[in-house]
């Protein structure tokens, strides 16, 4: 079998939901010594970056200015060390937002409920769309989808304090082109006294894991890597 390097990690810096005409930044984290990184979009080569010097950095940033529906879709990346290519990264879905109109989000029976009550969110958008999306702020990867002509409902079932937080909805014109976000609706759930402190499900800043952790190699890192390599050889 043809030898390949481990697959890189692809991330969106700050968010994968990019307002139209704004810039998206995608990071591809590969390996120290990689001489070339390639960003692929819907299976075709989109951009190339050659780090300088290659042995000192473990990834690159790809900048996508002027976001629009033509640039929204599935991205992946690969990298090369010498003549050897890596496996392809996982796919990253990049979404363009602020297309067309703004939906209205409401919640039934209301924004203040007690633990165990059944709650339903309603997202309404009068322009032609059939798919609606509900996101909890700070948890934008957990997208709930629902369908309807001008309105969709999102039944939450019996809620707990883990459901507390701000919610927004979008109308979707396709999987990668979303409307403006609705105004947020803050859901307050009382009860479960032992759980009333801020839980990890309620981060104070959104999507904190969406950061590009690219590092420059220091002399110390190089020594540690060399020591590790020597230790591995001794173990063999």
């Amino acid at each position: 079998p043809k030898q390949t390097l481990p697959k890189p990690i692809i991330r969106a810096e700050s968010t994968y939901m990019v307002p139209k005409e704004k810039q998206a930044t995608l990071c591809c984290q590969g390996s120290y010594g990689a001489v070339e990184y390639q960003l692929h979009f819907e299976g075709s080569l989109f951009a190339v970056e050659r780090p300088k010097p290659p042995e000192r950095i473990n990834g690159v940033k790809f900048h996508i200015p002027d976001m629009n529906s033509r640039k929204a879709g599935r991205y992946s990346c690969i990298y090369r060390v010498g003549e050897l290519w890596s496996e392809r990264s996982d796919l990253l879905d990049l979404v363009v937002t602020e297309m067309y109109d703004t939906p209205t989000l409401s919640v039934h029976p209301g924004p203040e409920v007690t633990s165990g009550e059944k709650v339903t969110f309603y997202c309404r958008l009068d322009t032609a769309t059939s798919m609606f999306l509900l996101l909890k702020e700070g948890r934008s990867r957990d997208v709930q989808r629902s369908y309807g002509k001008v309105q969709a409902e999102f039944p939450m079932g019996p809620v707990t304090t883990a459901h507390r937080g701000s919610y927004r909805c979008f109308g979707s014109y396709n999987n990668y082109a979303w409307s403006f976000p609705s105004e947020p609706v803050k859901l307050l759930v009382t009860g479960d006294i032992e759980n009333t402190s801020l839980a990890p499900t309620d981060p104070t800043f959104p999507d904190s894991w969406d950061t590009c952790l690219l590092t420059r190699e220091t002399g110390l890192q190089k020594d540690l890597a060399l020591w590790d390599h020597t230790a591995q050889n001794l173990l063999r």
Epitope: F41, F46, A47, V48, R50, V60, F62, I64, P65, K71
Partner: nanobody, 126 residues
Framework: EVQLVESGGGEVQPGGSLRLSCAAS????????MGWFRQAPGKEREFVAA???????YYADSVKGRFTISRDNAKNTVYLQMSSLRAEDTAVYYC????????????????????WGQGTLVTVKP
């Protein structure tokens, strides 16, 4: 707003050379990544060559070793030097820009480019 104007097209014999120029208006040229694309009659537009803001280059396999892309930031101009031309190089050649860009990205996909010139025709025939 960026405007791109191509020049240098014309008719040439197989094996001949041409140099295309693309003049950009505006002060953002130094922060732009630039590219050349071409479209032959009845075919889709295809990537030819691209250059980053710091002069890194990338070429389509079909032109590698024959075409050279370069830029002159003082003149707000990007060039495509074409040599060993073949009949299959006959096409309208378009200059394109990604503005603004950061880092050293070289853009290959046409969707990445947000400014385009009107094109210049290159015909290769005996």
């Amino acid at each position: 707003e960026v405007q791109l104007v191509e020049s240098g097209g014309g008719e040439v014999q197989p094996g001949g050379s041409l140099r295309l120029s693309c003049a950009a208006s505006g002060r953002t040229f130094a922060s732009a990544a630039m590219g050349w694309f071409r479209q032959a009659p009845g075919k889709e537009r295809e990537f030819v060559a691209a250059i980053s803001r710091s002069d890194d280059t990338y070429y389509a396999d079909s032109v590698k070793g024959r075409f050279t892309i370069s830029r002159d930031n003082a003149k707000n101009t990007v060039y495509l030097q074409m040599s060993s031309l073949r009949a299959e190089d006959t096409a309208v050649y378009y200059c394109a820009a990604v503005v603004p860009t950061y880092g050293n990205n070289i853009y290959v996909h046409s969707a990445a480019y947000n400014y385009w010139g009107q094109g210049t025709l290159v015909t290769v025939k005996p």
